[in-house]
């Protein structure tokens, strides 16, 4: 009997064997199908069509002050995805702002040379006459236009003749408004964090991204004006000179926007010099905003060159008069303040000179020369708080000029005199102009470059004029590096696991299944 | 209204020196470019100098270049015409002409002009 | 410098009668083209501004076109107060006047 027995229970196993062996067969025949055709899918999806087929683009910013040439590189086929431009080079031109050019517009072509030469270069020669040129110049052509639309109109002349003799495709200059300035700003950032994308990421390469798509603001300050453009939280506006409306990758965006003419850092120095100098009872400046011991002789004929001083205009008894430096921060920045007339609003909010403002919301990237005063004065640490960096310039703007000197040797004398100044302007600027609170502040991230991109209008121009941001979502989206290797990862493991339960299965012997049944 | 108001003509010797002056009033004088136009006995207007509202240009015809000196004084609400090495073919009457607009941007073309004041340079 | 020449440099019309004035210039001023109307004794007058926009106070029957280097005057139906001598000027360089069209009752 207990041989029948045991035969009956061997049978019994065998079949509980065969059985289980059966099921975990095909549970593994299909989990490694599944996972192989998932990475065949996964690897297509993303490696499609490889040969790469890189377009370039040029876009030349003429701002007040200076010309940066900005070159700009994508993959063909990706030309509709969020991110996938970026910028290889940026050459600066030697010399003033193209409106500088107005009495010698005849040179306005050796100005340019050096940075389309640089163009020529880093651009692969089969690529030249497929490679657009953009030219946008911004508020120091703005304001020679509001002195003569001619002059203005001579100079992108000249510029736009000596832009064709080059093998580029030249798609044309022009002065670009501040609204759009102000957008093409906050396209630009948005787009290099990845604010437009509609995918899930598992973890961030871009250190102010945040998992949500939450759009930053754009704080753009240069030397003539400054923009500020976010999207508030009320969507119904009391300016609609204020209001934009987008359609970007399948999304509605309402954005502020307003661009301050007169406001950039260097204009808004000219119109404090312009103000103070009215009250001085001699020839002789002491300004709050310059260093202990500075000096400086400006004529009066130069500090009444712009529009911008117009509302400071006065016969002098004087054709020049001295800047004495004494550096107090808060002089300074009380004087700073009488430029902002906060006195008239016709709205429920006003940033100043009675221009409406809604309520800030989200976080801020504050660029172009936001960054480079605060980056300078090394200011633009997430951990350093507003009071922190008022205390900060408190301390930069009372010490000695000599002693300035010394301590930033390499820097150029003229621009090491103003920091200073822009410091406490940006100060005041974000803080009263704005209405940015100590809380606040930390809200506003000062950035150079995101992914090695500067941050500024250039790339949303580009972006705009090359049709490259589409106003729906592409149907196909291609995965974003990080889910492509998390689902490569994924399915390769799947693999390995089922190649390895199906080896313990077949190469163990019968006790392996007696402990399983 | 505007009103431009030319004063400073007369006989002058050539090689001599002669300042004209342009009082200007009705508007805001800072905010426009200002010019000299001449226009010699019986012939056509000859554009002479501009001065642009700010003075980011200011440019002279080649008939007057290092000779004529174009000025303003915001204060006053006045514009000068500085002349000197004067010739025979500089007889003419002066006239003071604003810069128009072109909606926010200021024009190289001119809106008002004044009576003019004559200026004979004779020996 | 851009010279403008204007044509005819006389032109004799009867009240009532269009009249057609021309003036080119001798490279391309874009659009900165002006019209100015002077009677003898009188300073000049803005008539037409950028080739086509009529200056403030000035009737509806002057008209200007153009751009490039040929221009229009054009009176719709003369009257008695526009017999004068007209003038077109470029802004698009220095500026530079024509040598005037004198228009008379024919």
């Known amino acids: 009997m207990k041989g029948t027995k045991d035969l009956t229970s061997q049978q019994k196993e065998s079949n509980v064997k065969t059985f289980c062996s059966k099921n975990i067969l095909a549970i593994l025949g299909f989990s490694s199908i599944i996972a192989v055709i998932a990475l065949l899918a996964v690897g297509l999806t993303q490696n499609k069509a490889l040969p790469e087929n890189i377009k370039y683009g040029i876009v030349l910013d003429a701002g007040s002050s200076h010309t940066s040439l900005y070159i700009y590189k994508w993959p063909a086929e990706k030309e509709n995805d969020t991110g996938v431009v970026h910028q290889v080079e940026e050459c600066r031109v030697k010399g003033p702002g193209i409106s500088k050019y107005v009495q010698k517009v005849n040179e306005i072509g050796i100005y340019l040379t050096d940075c389309m030469e640089r163009a020529r270069e880093v651009i692969p020669r089969s690529q030249h006459q497929e490679t657009p040129v953009y030219l946008g110049a911004t508020a120091g052509m703005r304001l020679l236009r509001m002195e003569s639309e001619e002059l203005a109109d001579r100079v992108l002349d000249v510029v736009e003749r000596s832009l064709s003799n080059y093998p580029f495709d030249f798609q044309g200059a022009r002065i670009i408004t501040g609204q759009e300035e102000g957008a093409y700003g906050w396209i630009t950032i948005n787009y290099l964090l990845g604010k437009f994308s509609q995918k899930t990421r598992w973890f961030s390469i871009v250190p102010y991204e945040t998992n949500n798509q939450e759009t930053f603001g754009a704080l753009d300050l240069g030397g003539a004006s400054t923009q500020i453009t976010f999207v508030p939280q009320n969507q119904t506006t009391e300016s609609p000179d204020n209001a934009l409306q987008f359609r970007l990758y399948g999304k509605d965006y309402n954005v502020y926007t307003h661009s301050f003419l007169c406001y950039g850092k260097d204009q808004a120095l000219w119109q404090k010099l312009a103000k103070d100098i009215q009250v001085a009872s001699n020839e002789i400046l002491r300004d709050p905003c310059f260093h202990p011991g500075y000096k400086k002789v400006v004529n009066v004929s130069d500090l009444y060159k712009t529009p911008c001083t117009k509302r400071f205009e006065m016969t002098l008894p004087f054709q020049q008069f001295e800047i004495q430096g004494i550096g107090n921060y808060q002089q300074c920045h009380q004087s700073v303040l009488e430029l902002f007339n906060t006195s008239y609003c016709p709205y429920s909010q006003c940033a100043f000179n009675g221009i409406f403002l809604p309520p800030l919301q989200g976080d801020f990237g504050a660029f172009s020369a936001f960054y480079f005063v605060m980056n300078f004065l090394n200011l633009t640490s997430e951990k350093v708080s507003q009071e922190k960096v008022t205390e900060m310039m408190k301390k930069f703007c009372s010490q000695p000029w000599e002693e300035i000197k010394t301590s930033y040797a390499g820097v150029k004398e003229k621009y090491l005199s103003e920091y200073c100044f822009s410091g406490t302007y940006i100060l005041s600027l974000l803080l009263q102009g704005y209405h940015f609170t100590a809380d606040s502040w930390e809200h506003i991230h000062f950035i150079g470059k995101i992914q090695g991109s500067d941050a500024g209008w250039t790339l949303g121009y580009m972006l705009n004029l090359t049709n490259m941001i589409p106003a729906e979502q592409p149907l196909s989206t291609p995965l974003s590096h990080s889910t492509y290797v998390f689902l490569m990862v994924l399915f390769s493991l799947v693999l390995v696991i089922v190649a390895i339960i199906g080896l313990l299965i077949f190469h163990k012997p019968s006790y392996f299944w007696k402990d399983m049944v | 209204q505007v009103q431009l108001v030319e004063s400073g003509g007369g006989v002058v010797q050539p090689g001599r020196s002669l300042r004209l002056s342009c009082a200007a009033s009705?508007?805001?004088?800072?905010?426009?470019?200002m010019n000299w136009v001449r226009q010699a006995p019986g012939k056509g207007l000859e554009w002479v100098a501009s001065?642009?509202?700010?003075?980011?240009?200011?440019s002279y015809a080649d008939t007057v270049k290092g000779r004529f000196t174009i000025s303003r004084d915001n204060s006053k609400n006045t514009l000068y015409l500085q002349m000197s090495s004067l010739r025979a073919e500089d007889t003419a009457v002066y006239y003071c002409?604003?810069?128009?607009?072109?909606?926010?941007?200021?024009?190289?073309?001119?809106?008002?002009w004044g009576q003019g004041t004559m200026v004979t340079v004779s020996s | 410098e851009t010279v403008m020449t204007q044509s005819p440099a006389t032109l004799s019309v009867s009240p009532g009668e269009r009249a057609t004035l021309s003036c080119r210039a001798s490279?391309?001023?874009?659009?900165?083209m002006h019209w100015y109307q002077q009677k003898p004794g009188q300073a000049p007058r803005l008539l037409i501004y950028k080739a086509s926009n009529l200056a403030s106070g000035i009737p509806a029957r002057f008209s200007g076109s153009g751009s490039g280097t040929e221009f229009t005057l054009t009176i719709s139906s003369l009257q008695s107060e526009d017999f004068a001598v007209y003038y077109c000027q470029q802004s698009w360089n220095d500026p530079t006047f024509g040598q005037g069209t004198k228009l008379e009752l024919k």
């Open positions: 490279e391309g001023v874009k659009s900165y």
């Open positions: 001065f642009s509202s700010s003075s980011t240009y200011i």
């Open positions: 002409a604003r810069h128009g607009r072109y909606g926010g941007y200021g024009g190289f073309y001119f809106d008002y």
């Open positions: 009705g508007f805001t004088f800072n905010n426009y470019g």
